[in-house]
Interface confidence: low
């Protein structure tokens, strides 16, 4: 015959453990329901009762199968400079993210818990690393060759063009003028090709610092056009 | 007229540290971001470090990261980069460059750089 199915409440055998879904109250000394993912323990269970659950109220959730008196407060909401990607239900808490062309300084257990912006690489400096939802983007100087003429988080350093006659040189923020004969791409030297980010937001394993700068300065663009020739003194 | 002056660079052993100096005159020093790059021996510039003008937020390059500190004293108009753990890849010379704010963003003023030889 099959062994008799016990229904809680009930007291297990000395030294066993209570089946899945069930905890063991220590006041009762038995074991008990847990309540379901969106319900909570309203009143706990006795030698002769059951759990009884309830559900939790508007803005408080549980995600696992529990027996806490209380659900847990969904978050606050989502900032001005993030996105909520996942609602707070009654199974579920809020999940922020960052907004394209931010990325999360300071990550928490779910979503993000501060946003930054993505540095720009300013011209004669393209885009080295592109950011991703937990790094910064990583700007490097133009090499010999190649130019970036933009302010961006996306931009990398281009090949100059070869003319058959320069008009204007190119410099690692411009890119050269040919005169009217029809120009032809380089190969510049050094690697020139990046991966573009997934997204926008997309793009430090740069070890995410928080930010090292409040939004909007001018300093999160952070390094200028081209580096002088071995010697100079700049302009 | 704008002078930007490094100091501090010679030949050290790997592992070891080295302190740069960069004296800045003839431009607004405590309102302007600076920035160490360097140039390796295959002339390819790297951003190493940068440094808001009241020196509370800092940039690495993950290269240097946890090996490098890059500081300013706006007072003596002076930047600086102490550099440990030194290895043969750091080998390079080392520019201090400032932006002083009224320049769209660009490096506009450059120092003349000073060599940093790590032997093994």
């Known amino acids: 015959l099959p062994a008799q199915v016990a229904f809680t409440p009930y007291a297990p055998e000395p030294g066993g453990t209570c089946r899945l879904r069930e905890y063991y109250d220590q006041t009762a000394q038995m074991c008990c329901s847990k309540c379901p993912p969106g319900q909570h323990a309203k009143v706990f269970c006795t030698k002769t009762s059951d759990t009884v659950c309830d559900s939790c109220e508007d803005s408080t959730y549980t995600q696992l199968w529990n027996w806490v008196p209380e659900c847990l407060s969904c978050g606050s909401r989502c900032s001005s400079d993030q996105v909520e990607t996942q609602a707070c239900t009654r199974e579920q808490n809020r999940i922020c993210t960052c907004r394209p062309g931010w990325y999360c300084a300071l990550t928490k257990q779910e979503g993000c818990r501060l946003c930054a912006p993505l540095r720009k690489c300013r011209p004669g400096f393209g885009v080295a690393r592109p950011g991703t939802e937990t790094s910064d983007v990583v700007c490097k100087p133009c090499a010999p060759g190649t130019f970036s003429n933009t302010t961006s988080s996306t931009d990398i350093c281009r090949p100059h063009q070869i003319c058959n006659v320069v008009a204007v040189p190119g410099n690692a923020s411009m890119d050269a003028v040919c005169t009217s004969t029809s120009p032809t791409r380089s190969m510049a030297p050094g690697p020139v090709h990046l991966p573009q980010p997934v997204s926008t937001r997309s793009q430090h394993t740069q070890p995410t610092p928080a930010p090292s700068t409040a939004p909007g300065t001018s300093f999160l663009l952070p390094v200028g056009p081209s580096p002088p020739a071995e010697g100079s003194t700049g302009d | 007229d704008v002078q930007l002056v490094e100091s501090g660079g010679g030949l050290v052993q790997s592992g070891g540290s080295l302190r740069l100096s960069c004296a800045a005159s003839?431009?607004?020093?405590?309102?302007?971001?600076m920035t160490w790059v360097r140039q390796t021996s295959g002339s390819v510039f790297e951003w190493v470090s940068d440094?808001?003008?009241?020196?509370?937020?800092?940039r690495y390059a993950d290269s240097v990261k946890g090996r490098f500190i890059i500081s300013r004293d706006n007072a003596k108009s002076t930047l600086y980069l102490q550099m440990d753990s030194l290895k043969t890849d750091d080998t390079a010379v080392y520019y201090c460059?400032?932006?002083?704010?009224?320049?769209?963003?660009?490096?506009?003023?450059w120092g003349k750089g000073t060599l940093v030889t790590v032997s093994s």
């Open positions: 460059a400032a932006d002083p704010g009224s320049s769209g963003g660009s490096l506009s003023y």
């Open positions: 003839g431009f607004p020093f405590s309102s302007s971001d």
């Open positions: 440094i808001n003008p009241d020196g509370q937020n800092t």
